[in-house]
């Protein structure tokens, strides 16, 4: 599997997606998960419904949400007030049984927030009719790992 | 009506190649998972591996790893069990079963069955 | 692997007994879990998946029940078209493993 890199922004969300063949794994629950060293295995942070008809429910597991369109084949993953611990590798994930077939490893990058360095002056605060869910902007800016990158540094 | 139909008996000698098929009809079968099971004479059954037909993406049991060959096409419904070169231990019936996800526990289970081919491999 | 051990290997029976064959898992399995009937020179048939959902067709009198290690296949009134050879069958994990079979006889 080749690696994915999604960038998102400290304190803002980031929405992973994870496109897969809806009829080979239709009626699989699907997992999100973080990888624990190269060749470590993968923590389960979050998976969908255990009924698989109900997937299209949000589940939340502290700040990271799983939600699969199973007739579209595509899992997101949403990672709300993205810290840069967030950073690292991660997995999307089919379940059968007790197995898991990954559908795409990716790259989680955190990037520093620009308005940190700002004055208070320079922010902006949403009115008090405006909710910052309505005001909030998602970045998922994604691309693939050149070859020869890695995403573990290398151990001494 | 979903049918799997397999072709032929084969006898065969020590050391030939042979490539059995399932013919599926009656539903996708570009869709579906296709598990090839071997039952040896008066035996039990033995999972030998099994392909997505979609994308011929295969899981081999590590006791046919490396014996067998499984492939399919799914422009002609069919799936494929190979050798290249044949045992006297490989006579069996070998049967290939449509692999079927049961949406309620996310796992699949063997639902339709092709009638089976028997191989013999005797000099 | 994970081996699947059934009890008895072979069992006799009367048309209108009460019959239960066991399958036991190495390991837990939760309810990944199919058995299969097999008449002679024919392929298997499945019969309940998921150790408890009878498959569409398959008679009322054929039960499945457990979870984790320890599986029961119930024929709750023999009929003549039950003698045959049951077999259990993990989902749990790769490769699928079966139970070595119970050749119900009749008696």
């Known amino acids: 599997h080749n690696t994915t890199v999604f960038q998102g922004v400290a304190g803002q969300s980031l929405q992973v997606s994870c496109p897969y063949d809806s009829m080979k794994h239709w009626g699989r629950r699907k997992a999100w998960c973080r990888q624990l060293g190269e060749k470590g295995p993968c923590q389960r942070v979050v998976s969908t419904h255990n009924l698989w008809l109900l997937s299209f429910l949000r589940r939340w597991n502290g700040s990271t949400a799983i939600t699969d369109d199973t007739l579209g084949g595509t899992l997101t993953i949403t990672l709300r007030n993205l810290q840069p611990h967030d950073a690292g590798l991660y997995q999307c994930q089919s379940l059968h049984g007790s197995e898991a077939d990954t559908l795409r490893k990716v790259l989680v990058e955190v990037l520093a927030d620009p308005l940190d360095h700002r004055d208070a002056g320079d922010l902006w605060f949403p009115g008090e009719s405006e909710s910052f869910e309505d005001a909030h902007v998602e970045h998922s800016i994604s691309r693939s790992l050149l070859e020869g990158e890695i995403p573990f540094p290398p151990t001494s | 009506e979903v049918q799997l139909v397999q072709s032929g008996a084969e006898v065969k000698k020590p050391g030939e190649s042979l490539k059995i098929s399932c013919k599926g009809s009656?539903?996708?079968?570009?869709?579906?998972?296709i598990a090839w099971v071997r039952q040896m004479p008066g035996k039990g059954l033995e999972w030998m591996g099994t392909i997505y037909p979609g994308d011929s993406d295969t899981r081999y049991s590590p006791s046919f790893q490396g014996q067998v060959t499984i492939s399919a096409d799914k422009s002609i419904s069919t799936a494929y069990l190979q050798w290249s070169s044949l045992k006297a231990s490989d006579t069996a019936m070998y049967f290939c079963?449509?692999?079927?996800?049961?949406?309620?526990?996310?796992?699949?289970?063997?639902?339709?069955w092709g009638q089976g081919t028997l191989v013999t491999v005797s000099s | 692997d994970i081996q699947m051990t059934q009890s008895p290997s072979s069992v006799s029976a009367s048309v209108g007994d009460r019959v239960t064959i066991t399958c036991r898992a190495s390991?837990?399995?939760?309810?990944?879990l199919a058995w299969y009937q097999q008449k002679p020179g024919k392929a298997p048939k499945l019969l309940i998946y998921?150790?408890?959902w009878l498959q569409n067709g398959v008679p009322s009198r054929f039960s499945g029940s457990g979870s984790g290690t320890d599986f029961t296949l119930t024929i709750s009134s023999l009929q003549p078209e039950d003698f045959a050879t049951y077999f259990c069958q993990q989902a749990d994990s790769y490769p699928r493993t079966f139970g070595q079979g119970t050749k119900l006889e009749i008696k």
């Open positions: 079963a449509r692999s079927r996800t049961f949406y309620y526990d996310s796992s699949d289970y063997f639902d339709y």
């Open positions: 390991q837990g399995i939760s309810s990944w």
């Open positions: 009656g539903y996708s079968f570009a869709s579906y998972w």
């Open positions: 998921a150790a408890s």
